[in-house]
Amino acid sequence: ELLDPCGYISPESPVVQLHSNFTAVCVLKEKCMDYFHVNANYIVWKTNHFTIPKEQYTIINRTASSVTFTDIASLNIQLTCNILTFGQLEQNVYGITIISGLPPEKPKNLSCIVNEGKKMRCEWDGGRETHLETNFTLKSEWATHKFADCKAKRDTPTSCTVDYSTVYFVNIEVWVEAENALGKVTSDHINFDPVYKVKPNPPHNLSVINSEELSSILKLTWTNPSIKSVIILKYNIQYRTKDASTWSQIPPEDTASTRSSFTVQDLKPFTEYVFRIRCMKEDGKGYWSDWSEEASGITYEDRPSKAPSFWYKIDPSHTQGYRTVQLVWKTLPPFEANGKILDYEVTLTRWKSHLQNYTVNATKLTVNLTNDRYLATLTVRNLVGKSDAAVLTIPACDFQATHPVMDLKAFPKDNMLWVEWTTPRESVKKYILEWCVLSDKAPCITDWQQEDGTVHRTYLRGNLAESKCYLITVTPVYADGPGSPESIKAYLKQAPPSKGPTVRTKKVGKNEAVLEWDQLPVDVQNGFIRNYTIFYRTIIGNETAVNVDSSHTEYTLSSLTSDTLYMVRMAAYTDEGGKDGPEFTFTTPKFAQGEIEHHHHHH
């Protein structure tokens, strides 16, 4: 019969508010008190197996003892009532678990969405963590009809999907009740027509059609979601070129009501565009649909919009009365070619004489010309037509170029090599910029680009390397031929030299030494050599550093000690740092030349 508990604790299953006070009472049964010869004075209270100090106990009567907790901070307390029996042995009487937590807060930010074709889903902010099982119930009603409660699932406690069909044009009232063992609260009620909460399905079957008449347009067609019969739709249409990562958007005011097609204008010819579209209720109440699947189309070709860059080079070794001229041009970028380039047409007209025609597939043409003045034209052709002509005057052999650009400068900025100049007073048709890498090992292979006559600042559009010295030449081109070229050297990005200078002695005296060195080869300079530093020391002395201008190739060390071994090395510096050359040693003589002779004579 003693398997029966010796007593009980009241309350049996308490749930209390965190940081509140709580009192439990342990009541002993008479038969237990008799059996163990105890009363309430013998009760020992424990939480999680730790004895509670007696000061927290209250003896109510011979059978009952209470314990009071203030400011409960634990979520779960195992409370046991025990009695001290013979020989101070503890006997468990009863145990309970005190669960603590917080009452629910009033749910906030209740909002609902009707995904087209699905039932209405509402979500809310449930408030702080209660540490207790808290049930959320979504309530909804019409003025004349209560709908079944929607009980939020344990794993998604702050949203619920109703189980009735959505009816548009009828106002519905919705609210949330939150309830746990410590209380029940209700959110504010919201009242709305579900038509204002619609998230439409995205438009589908998006397709793109091009126009043979206009190379700057593409027509989009799509199928609207079924909800179009209930709401007027507005759209976002976005597009980008195939390789771009950012989207452009059609002005929303152009697509502000239900439609199933749209013509996108001001596009580039012969360009692949990707489109996507989404929709929502036209007054902006509700939600945007997801984006449609993307669809792409290519605008129709147009004739090339620009003449190619056009230049020439004359072979310096020419036979009597003739010269070899290489005409060169650049392929147009796709946005100017406007289609697949078929060929180039070159015409050459000897001054006031007959015309020669050439059709070329490459981007150069080598011709033998007399020493006369020639007019060359170049057009590029695609399926639709020809570009405007680029015109070039190849002056006669005795032509004297004049009027160069002035104040030519070149400098790196934003990982590009910029060139700027002051324009000559004369009317310039265009500028030709040529550049090549200066190297001791290889010839200067020229790349070039053309700029409009109004330009006086540009960057080199080649594939430039860092730490290479570029020789940049700017030639203004006039109606009657090229002007005088101007050149400048520049680096895209400097680095310290790869090697330092090798210093040697030219002449060594008792108290001075003339050092000499070679200019660093351009391939190892990696930048403009701004200055040199000569470091010299004796075996036991401190090192001395001397700065030397970069234009020098020799330097005299003075005030040296005679009959002394010197170690000397030299560093060359660019704007990005320096590099030491190898160390060289020399010894100063004991006597100056005259002194040695004088000693011999004396003896």
Epitope: W142, S165, Y168, F169, V170, N171, D193, V230
Partner: antibody
Framework: EVQVVESGGDLLLPGGSLKLSCAVS????????MSWVRQTPDKRLELVAT????????YYPDSVKGRFTISRDNAKHTLYLQMSSLKSEDTAMYYC?????????WGQGTLVTVSA | VIVLTQSHKFMSTSVGDRVSITCKAS??????VAWYQQKVGHSPKLLIY???TRHTGVPDRFTGSGSGTDFTLTISNVQSEDLADYFC?????????FGGGTKLEIK
Amino acid sequence: EVQVVESGGDLLLPGGSLKLSCAVSGFTFNAYGMSWVRQTPDKRLELVATINSNGDSTYYPDSVKGRFTISRDNAKHTLYLQMSSLKSEDTAMYYCANFYGGFPYWGQGTLVTVSA
Amino acid sequence: VIVLTQSHKFMSTSVGDRVSITCKASQDVDTAVAWYQQKVGHSPKLLIYWAVTRHTGVPDRFTGSGSGTDFTLTISNVQSEDLADYFCQQYSSYPYTFGGGTKLEIK
């Protein structure tokens, strides 16, 4: 007591236009969506237009879209149906009803006959 | 478009009997169904909505049941004033549509 009274029905030629009215009393007009439902001579019922309580959303089936326009004046407790480009198949008794999923309150109807 | 089929155009019953009028939807309409009674020369009158909920003032001998595609209006203890046409209607998706009607005749 709820009262719904339609008016404006007439006999007219195909291609003609007509405006029906519906006066409502006995319930809070501006709290309800309203509809026009027609019943053809063979007793078939068809919803022809619905408008929400504040008048900014409407619905029309394909059979009347672009030809019929539903509107309401909440101050006057009145519902309207403007019909144009009428066809012989539009011949029917036109009822005005408040909309609550079902249609709780209907008027007595107004007859529209389209015939050459 | 959801089509509602009331397979019996006419049904005959006696006063005091129980009669069931059926309505079948061409696709799932959940419980978004209403039933109407129309007596000769009168406008339709709402009896049931949400498939099972009686409209205000409708006698409890009218009972609605069903969900999905199959719905029934049951009149128990038929009275002579129940002589009328009965229509079902769905409001699950636009266009909201009506059945063709069932005429209840009293023997």
